[in-house]
Interface confidence: low
């Protein structure tokens, strides 16, 4: 294999034939970002998932999926060294494989979930190239406590992680949607308080707003400086 090829961090190509599989190549020890474009209108309101094909006729085993609340799909979720984030307006699902290892190579799928069904957005073949410098940067070992196996990968879990300095927390289109929701909530809250004061009511007695914005009591939405992945 020519030296130039080893220096390529990412190489995307379409395989010939009916498989229609996209190949993503990454270098061992480094990060690989996989993108799965989709029709944002067709898949509106649907959560997404990243799974590994276990066999020719076997199931696709879930590795990680987007946030349980679709409106919070922009929040990056982790399972071990694999992260997923969804730009629901732009129609791009992004999967990041940190500290890529040879055993990460294989066939995967980006999926759109609806009920118990799953539509395949893209079939992805991940290939791992040897590190031309043959070194391992300790900075790439994000979660040393995590097993490198996919044992119990169907059991989804997230790792809380503070956003790194300079890291974009989520796509611009999604942040606009979130800010719009927050702005509307503030306007409604202010209006309710103003109405309560006007009618001489106690501030706590105003009717609850019907605008949910996907907010669940179990999730505390924090402002950007303190934002953490759920």
């Amino acid at each position: 294999m020519e030296p130039l090829r080893l220096l390529i961090l990412l190489f995307v190509t379409e395989l010939s034939g009916a498989h229609n599989t996209t190949v993503f190549q990454g270098v061992a020890g480094q990060s690989l970002q996989v993108s799965c474009p989709y029709d944002s209108m067709k898949h509106w309101g649907r959560r997404k998932a990243w799974c590994r094909q276990l066999g020719e006729k076997g199931p696709c085993q879930r590795v990680v999926s987007t946030h349980n609340l679709w409106l919070l799909s922009f929040l990056r979720r982790w399972n071990g060294s694999t992260a997923i984030t969804d730009d629901t307006l732009g129609g791009t699902l992004t999967i990041t494989l940190r500290n890529l290892q040879p055993h990460d190579a294989g066939l995967y799928q980006c999926q759109s979930l609806h009920g118990s069904e799953a539509d395949t957005l893209r079939k992805v073949l991940v290939e791992v190239l040897a590190d031309p410098l043959d070194h391992r940067d300790a900075g790439d070992l994000w979660f040393p406590g995590e097993s490198e196996s996919f044992e119990d990968a169907h059991v989804e879990h997230s790792i809380s992680r503070s956003l790194l300095e300079g890291e974009i927390p989520f796509p611009p289109t999604s942040i606009l949607l979130l800010l719009a929701c927050i702005f509307l909530i503030k306007i409604l809250a202010a209006s309710a308080l103003w109405a309560a004061a006007w009618h001489g009511q106690k501030p706590g007695t105003h009717p609850p707003s019907e605008l949910d914005c996907g907010h669940d009591p179990g999730y505390q939405l924090q402002t950007l400086p303190g934002l953490r992945d759920t």
Epitope: S16, G55, Q101, A105, G106, E127, F150, E151
Partner: antibody
Framework: QVQLQESGPGLVKPSETLSLTCTVS????????WSWIRQPPGKGLEWIGS???????NYNPSLKSRVTISVDTSKNQFSLKLSSVTAADTAVYYC?????????????WGQGTLVTVSS | EIVLTQSPATLSLSPGERATLSCRAS??????LAWYQQKPGQAPRLLIY???NRATGIPARFSGSGSGTDFTLTISSLEPEDFAVYYC?????????FGGGTKVEIK
């Protein structure tokens, strides 16, 4: 159905390079991954390395410095080169197809070829 | 690398008897485990993949079970052609590794 056939010299001198070729028939090499596995006489199996038709390779760390696997899609063949051989490299060498994923089980296998390292 | 330990090293049984072969991994390999049969002078033949799925053309008397670190290959009723060496192989961790083998011989 896919069949694999190993070919190459049965005797190699110490310090020389062992060269074997695997010819795939009954199917295209331009899909799946392909591996070399060896078995010293009376011992267990050891995976050597694998290659994809695109040329992407992975080797067993214990042999990495001495192994080169290449592919020739036009001939539907892939090859193994093992340099600086010693008597410890005497074994039956098998080529095999990965049943599915690049990291996967092996099926089918070639019938194997015995390579003896001796002066 | 993952070490696979097979036991027993040798199993002496008669045709018609039940054979139970064990494979233990040094750490969890989930269900990413295969079993092979090898007869003298022949290449290994895939019997089971993904711990319990029979490969094409493999008789129903062969079955695999287990997950994590402990796996079992069971031959419900031994046929004369089943006397051979059996290997397990994991394929989740790099590099893929094989167990040392269990020889099933005629008692």
């Amino acid at each position: 159905q896919v069949q694999l056939q190993e070919s190459g010299p049965g005797l190699v001198k110490p310090s020389e390079t062992l060269s074997l070729t695997c010819t795939v028939s009954g199917g295209s090499i331009s899909s799946y991954y392909w591996s070399w596995i060896r078995q010293p006489p009376g011992k267990g199996l050891e995976w050597i390395g694998s290659i994809y038709y695109s040329g992407s390779t992975n080797y067993n760390p214990s042999l990495k410095s001495r192994v080169t696997i290449s592919v020739d899609t036009s001939k539907n063949q892939f090859s193994l080169k093992l340099s600086s051989v010693t008597a410890a490299d005497t074994a039956v060498y098998y080529c095999a197809r990965h049943g599915w994923d690049r990291v996967g089980w092996f099926d089918p296998w070639g019938q194997g070829t015995l390579v003896t390292v001796s002066s | 690398e993952i070490v696979l330990t097979q036991s027993p090293a040798t199993l002496s049984l008669s045709p018609g008897e039940r054979a139970t072969l064990s494979c233990r991994a040094s750490q969890s390999v989930s269900r990413y485990l295969a079993w092979y049969q090898q007869k003298p002078g022949q290449a290994p033949r895939l019997l089971i993949y993904d711990a319990s799925n029979r490969a094409t053309g493999i008789p129903a008397r062969f079955s695999g079970s287990g997950s994590g670190t402990d796996f079992t290959l069971t031959i419900s009723s031994l046929e004369p052609e089943d006397f051979a060496v059996y290997y397990c192989q994991q394929y989740i961790f790099w590099p893929p590794t094989f167990g040392g083998g269990t020889k099933v011989e005629i008692k």
